[in-house]
């Protein structure tokens, strides 16, 4: 990948990821550099007849490194200060190559949840306000409320009536995803008005 | 039917500022989220960031913090843009565009051109 | 952020031809959206979560792909297809679109 414009990779959180090294063909390779975020992470001398030297330079992610037989970095255990932008020098005997990546740290979705705040009308409507959540959401994380295949929110909150005289049994489904993970939760709209209707009764009595 | 009606045509001397409006009507306003993008005179479309219409909070992408505001006002369904401090460089359609989810921009405001010159 | 790099950014042809329309990510993405934007028009949605054809398009469009490479495929051009077609992704902030291909009448 040309210097100019990074290969992006997406990692998985506590996972391991690969940053793939591709050698000028032909070309006897003197070393090789990693970087990372302009720091030095390894130094590599190949050797034909014996395993290469390799010199780890940064100690933090140290113990999680490791080299395939291309020299392309893996990274194991993956945390998310691991976010950033990883260089790759390739020096031979008349040039030097530079390979540039992006690493994107992602987190698998978790504990998903929903949160109900309805009441019930006089006229026996129940307006649901449901908010729906999972574990460290940011700001990559898409939410949705589905209905018979409908999208009726994409927000995390969705509103909606129900009025139990005139609706059939209705499930909500809340999705949550991102680019490496999804999760549903659904709520049923009568188990929900029901609850709200006892609470609304024993208020009453 | 669902639409998103925008306010017209701005003319504005650099350092003025403008209040972009985006109206809603055909569905519960707040359950969908509200995005704004910029088209710049013959360029590309550019995402602006968003604001979710039920929490009022916005989003805004690197290159529109600071100079740009998303609003609503849910009485009246309508979000708005404003944008301080008008550069040249501002001048641009800009567009309302309500997400279905997973950032499908299913409705488009008809957009709004800002022209910024003294 | 992700760049979507689409090509070929002119694609001249003549109705009834085939249009393959590609969109490259820089980086793996869950799912492609396109819309289609005529001069002096709002862009109009045309094709979500890869394949999935808005509300009203006609069946001539189809939409395929994953990871990094998506296509919009014409099977047969007709004239209210010649426009500019954008693609766009929701997989990380920010929602980035691709620079466009215009479909030209050759």
């Known amino acids: 990948q040309s210097s100019l414009t990074p290969l992006m990779v997406n990692g998985i959180l506590g996972e391991s990821v690969t940053l793939p090294l591709e050698f000028p063909a032909g070309e006897k390779v003197n070393f090789i550099t990693w970087l990372f975020n302009e720091t030095s992470l390894a130094f590599i001398v190949p050797h034909e007849t014996k395993s290469p030297e390799i010199h780890v330079t940064n100690p933090k992610q140290g113990k999680r490194l490791n080299f395939t037989q291309s020299y392309s970095l893996q990274l194991s255990n993956l945390k998310m200060e691991d976010t950033g932008s990883y260089r790759a020098q390739i020096s031979t005997k008349t040039s030097a190559k530079l390979s540039s990546y992006t690493l994107r740290i992602l987190r698998q979705l978790r504990n998903i949840q929903v949160t109900n705040h309805s009441q019930l009308f006089q006229n026996m409507t129940c307006e649901l306000h449901l908010t729906c959540s999972v574990e460290d959401a940011d700001d990559n994380v898409s939410f949705r409320w589905e209905a018979l295949g409908n999208t009726l929110s994409s927000q995390p909150n969705l509103t909606v009536s129900w009025d139990p005289r005139i609706s059939s049994e209705q499930d909500y489904t809340c999705i949550a995803e991102n680019a490496v993970s999804n999760l549903s939760f659904s709520v049923s709209a009568q188990k929900l008005c029901e609850d709200v209707k006892i609470q609304y009764t024993d208020t009453k009595m | 039917q669902i639409q998103l009606v925008q306010s017209g045509s701005e003319l504005k001397k650099p350092g003025a500022s403008v209040k972009v409006s985006c109206k809603a009507s055909g569905y519960t306003f707040t359950n969908y989220g509200m995005n704004w993008v910029r088209q710049a005179p013959g360029q590309d479309l550019k995402w602006m960031g968003w604001i979710n219409t039920y929490s009022g909070e916005p989003r805004y992408a690197d290159d529109f913090k600071g100079r740009f505001v998303f609003s609503l006002d849910k009485s009246v369904n309508t979000a708005y843009l404003q944008i301080s401090s008008l550069k040249a460089e501002d001048t641009a359609v800009y567009y309302c565009?309500?997400?279905?989810?997973?950032?499908?921009?299913?409705?488009w405001g008809q957009g709004t051109t800002v022209t910024v010159s003294s | 952020q992700i760049v979507l790099s689409q090509s070929p950014a002119t694609l001249s042809l003549s109705p009834g031809e085939r249009a393959t329309l590609s969109c490259r990510a820089s980086?793996?993405?869950?799912?492609m959206h396109w819309y289609q934007q005529k001069p002096g028009q709002a862009p109009r949605p045309w094709i979500y979560?890869?394949?999935n054809l808005a509300s009203g398009i006609p069946a001539r469009f189809s939409g395929s792909g994953s990871g990094t490479d998506y296509t919009l495929t014409i099977s047969s051009l007709e004239p209210e297809d010649f426009a500019v077609y954008y693609c766009q992704q929701w997989s990380s902030t920010p929602r980035t679109f691709g620079g466009g291909t215009k479909v030209e009448i050759k």
């Open positions: 979560a890869t394949s």
């Open positions: 980086s793996s993405v869950s799912h």
């Open positions: 565009a309500r997400d279905y989810g997973r950032w499908y921009f299913d409705v």
